[in-house]
C-alpha cells in the first residue's frame, strides 16, 4: 500500500533534499526542500518526508514525475517521485530527470553529442493508463537538436515546459508534444476532476498564466457537472 | 508569496473532533496541492495530510488514516481538516502548508510553503 511506503525505511533514510535524492535507487519518493518555519528561513530543510499529491507531471517540481508510487497501490492516488537517470527505466520523458528523454524504456542522455544534426524518435503519449509503454505507437516526429539548447517557439516540438520560451508551456497537440500559449484571462481552461483525466485529451491546453486560476465561470455554476465552463479568472 | 491562516484549533476531549480550515491568499495561483503537518512538543514536525486540489487525491499518514479527513474548497481558496477520534497523541500545533511545486515556476523539487500553525490539545 501507499502507506507502507511511505513508510519504509527507504523513504525515512533518504538522503537531504538537496543531496541528489533523485534517481536515487530506493527513493520511492523526493522530499521537498521549501521549507517555511515560523520566524525562520524560507529554504531550510527538514528530514522527514513530505509526500506530494499530484494530477500531473507540470505539478511536480523540475527534478519530478506524477505517478502512483507502487503497482497496485491505494487506488487513485498519484505523488511527485524523483526523476529518472540514465540508464533507469521509464515509460514517457516526464520520468528522466533534465538532459533525459525516454526511448524505448529507458532514459537517455539528450546532450549535444547524442543530438547532433536531427533524429528521428517516436513520441506517443498515454491516454489513461499510467504504465502504457511510449513507444506503442507508429507515428513518428522529427526532433532537432536545436530545441534543447534554445526555448522552443509556438508549436515547436517539446518535451516539458521548461524546453519552451516565457509565456509558454509544452502540451500534447495529437501524439506529440508542442509549446501553447500559457492561458490569459477569459480563456477556457481544464481542470482535472480525476486521476487520468488529462491523459485522454490529444489536444491539451496550458495552465492559467500568472495571477490567474482555473474556475468555474460565474454564470455556469447552475450547470451540470459535466457541462460546466472552467475559464482563466483574476482573483 | 502565499499567505495562509490556519483556525479550528483548542481543547478536546479524547475520542472528540475538531474542524480545522486554512484560508490562502496571495499567490493563490501558484498552489495545485494543499496539506496539514503537525509538530508535538519536543518531536519533529510530521506530515499529517495532502490534497491536490486539481486531482482530488488525497494522501494521509498511517497514524491518522480512517481517523482524519482533509478536503478542499476551491472556491474559497480553503483547506480544512476534520478530525475524529482525537487521541492524546495527536496534541500538536497544527500547520496548514501550501504546495507550489509547479515546473512551470522553476522549483525542482514539489514544495510546501507554511503558515503559523493553530494549536490542538487533546486532554481530559
Known amino acids: 500500500t501507499l502507506n507502507s511506503v511511505l513508510n519504509s525505511n527507504a523513504i525515512k533514510n533518504l538522503p537531504p533534499p538537496l543531496g541528489g535524492a533523485a534517481g536515487h535507487p530506493g527513493s520511492a519518493v523526493s522530499a521537498a526542500p521549501g521549507i517555511l518555519y515560523p520566524g525562520g528561513n524560507k529554504y531550510q530543510t527538514i528530514d522527514n518526508y513530505q509526500p506530494y499529491p499530484c494530477a500531473e507531471d507540470e505539478e511536480c517540481g523540475t527534478d519530478e514525475y506524477c505517478a502512483s508510487p507502487t503497482r497496485g497501490g491505494d487506488a487513485g492516488v498519484q505523488i511527485c517521485l524523483a526523476c529518472r537517470k540514465r540508464r533507469k527505466r521509464c515509460m514517457r520523458h516526464a520520468m528522466c530527470c533534465p538532459g533525459n528523454y525516454c526511448k524505448n524504456g529507458i532514459c537517455v542522455s539528450s546532450d549535444q553529442n547524442h543530438f547532433r544534426g536531427e533524429i528521428e524518435e517516436t513520441i506517443t503519449e498515454s491516454f489513461g493508463n499510467d504504465h502504457s509503454t511510449l513507444d506503442g505507437y507508429s507515428r513518428r516526429t522529427t526532433l532537432s537538436s536545436k530545441m534543447y539548447h534554445t526555448k522552443g517557439q509556438e508549436g515547436s516540438v517539446c518535451l516539458r515546459s521548461s524546453d519552451c520560451a516565457s509565456g509558454l508551456c509544452c502540451a500534447r497537440h495529437f501524439w506529440s508534444k508542442i509549446c501553447k500559449p500559457v492561458l490569459k484571462e477569459g480563456q477556457v481552461c481544464t481542470k482535472h476532476r480525476r486521476k487520468g483525466s488529462h491523459g485522454l485529451e490529444i489536444f491539451q491546453r496550458c495552465y492559467c498564466g500568472e495571477g490567474l486560476s482555473c474556475r468555474i465561470q460565474k454564470d455556469h455554476h447552475q450547470a451540470s457537472n459535466s457541462s460546466r465552463l472552467h475559464t482563466c479568472q483574476r482573483h | 508569496e502565499v499567505q495562509l491562516v490556519e483556525s479550528g484549533g483548542g481543547l478536546v476531549q479524547p475520542g472528540g473532533s475538531l474542524r480545522l480550515s486554512c484560508a490562502a491568499s496571495?499567490?493563490?495561483?501558484?498552489?495545485?496541492?494543499m496539506g496539514w503537518f503537525r509538530q508535538a512538543p519536543g518531536k519533529e514536525r510530521e506530515f499529517v495530510a495532502a490534497?491536490?486540489?486539481?486531482?482530488?487525491?488525497?494522501v494521509y499518514a498511517d497514524s491518522v488514516k480512517g481517523r482524519f479527513t482533509i478536503s478542499a474548497d476551491n472556491s474559497k481558496n480553503t483547506a480544512y481538516l476534520q478530525m475524529n477520534s482525537l487521541k492524546p497523541e495527536d496534541t500538536a500545533v497544527y500547520y496548514c502548508?501550501?504546495?507550489?511545486?509547479?515546473?512551470?515556476?522553476?522549483?525542482?523539487?514539489?514544495?510546501?510553503?507554511w503558515g503559523q500553525g493553530t494549536l490542538v490539545t487533546v486532554s481530559s
Open positions: 490534497i491536490n486540489w486539481s486531482g482530488g487525491s488525497t
Open positions: 496571495g499567490g493563490i495561483y501558484r498552489v495545485n496541492t
Open positions: 502548508a501550501a504546495g507550489n511545486g509547479g515546473r512551470q515556476y522553476g522549483h525542482s523539487r514539489a514544495r510546501y510553503d
